[in-house]
């Protein structure tokens, strides 16, 4: 239990089009040092959804204050969900490296499905 684990508790989240989707993720440790990133899909073709360290992600907000000391909650909320957002989202811990950070451990994934907007 000492080594960092990535907890993505929900296997599946269903959201109506136009609403926000909350994707939960937490780490069991602050070590190793390095950023968290969220991806849609796995493997080489995965899409970056959020990078804790850098970048502009206008539809993504963090659920808790990531600058807070000892914060282990890296959940995100994605606004204005559309059917194109459906897929499996992975919360991934990276280990700080030089020159590049190295992927350390991934969560098990959360499948996001999108329901038609209620009429």
């Amino acid at each position: 239990e000492d080594e960092l684990q990535v907890i993505q508790p929900e296997k599946s989240v269903s959201v109506a089009a136009g609403e926000s989707a909350t994707l939960r993720c937490a780490m069991t440790s602050l070590i190793p040092v390095g950023p968290i990133m969220w991806f849609r899909g796995a493997g080489a073709g995965r899409e970056l959804i959020y990078n804790q360290k850098e970048g502009h992600f206008p539809r993504v907000t963090t659920v808790s204050e990531l600058t807070k000391r000892n914060n282990l909650d890296f959940s995100i909320s994605i606004s204005n969900i559309t059917p194109a957002d459906a897929g499996t989202y992975y919360c991934v811990k990276f280990r700080k490296g030089s020159p590049d950070d190295v992927e350390f451990k991934s969560g098990a994934g959360t499948e996001l499905s999108v329901r038609a907007k209620p009429s």
Epitope: E1, S12, A26, T88, A108, G109
Partner: antibody, heavy 123, light 113 residues
């Protein structure tokens, strides 16, 4: 060896509230998922809700929404389930259970259970 | 909510014979990304809390005798006790652990014929 020890039996009046505790020993409490399950006399198992202390917020079955509050105190490794507006149909054994997972996999079942707390609602 | 339907409600089987319990979920509990079914089976004896027997539909929990086996995928699942022993008399429950609320089946009481 993980253990869950629950508080003792309670007898309550209709309309009152009951708060049941579940103290964990062993393992890392903050990353546990603790579920509460109840069983009325001669009946089946009913999932009421659960909490993962590391996230802080609980989720509840619709049937109990607004009447049940599940909390966790990481400093004492204790989870709590409070049920309000009690009625005779709430007479049951209430169990806490730890949901289990392997490394960074999903939670997949409840592998450690408390001994159960009998709550009797009677006027 | 996902509705779990167990059958039969009760089952009487001779010692050494096979016992089969069925469980049907109202929607799939298969997580496609890892091809695992989030379906668990529990055994409960009178006056005791439930005990986890099977998870991921077919993986035996540590210490569970190999006469217990689980099968199925998607929405249809089966728990089999290949050779019923006296200590297997209990109520058996399936539970989906895919989407909260993590609903249980109604239970199947297994007795000796």
């Amino acid at each position: 060896q993980v253990q869950l020890v629950q508080s003792g039996a309670e007898v309550k009046k209709p309309g009152s509230s009951v708060k049941v505790s579940c103290k964990a020993s062993g393992g890392t409490f903050s990353s546990y998922a603790i579920s509460w399950v109840r069983q009325a006399p001669g009946q089946g198992l009913e999932w009421m809700g659960g909490i993962i202390p590391i996230f802080g917020t609980a989720s509840y079955a619709q049937k109990f929404q607004g009447r049940v509050t599940i909390t966790a105190d990481e400093s004492t490794s204790t989870a709590y389930m409070e049920l309000s507006s009690l009625r005779s149909e709430d007479t049951a054994v209430y169990y806490c259970a730890r949901e289990t997972r392997q490394d960074s996999a999903h939670y997949y079942g409840m592998d450690v259970w408390g001994q159960g707390t009998t709550v009797t609602v009677s006027s | 909510d996902i509705v779990m339907t167990q059958s039969p409600d009760s089952l009487a089987v001779s010692l050494g014979e096979r016992a089969t319990i069925n469980c049907k979920s109202s929607q799939s509990v298969l997580f496609s990304s890892n091809n695992k079914n989030y379906l668990a089976w529990y055994q409960q004896k009178p006056g005791q809390p439930p005990k986890l027997l099977i998870y991921w539909a077919s993986t035996r929990e540590s210490g569970v005798p190999d006469r217990f086996s689980g099968s199925g995928s998607g929405t249809d699942f089966t728990l089999t006790i290949s050779s019923l022993q006296a200590e297997d008399v209990a109520v058996y429950y399936c539970q989906q652990h895919y989407i909260a609320p993590f609903t249980f089946g109604g239970g199947t009481k297994v007795e000796i014929k």
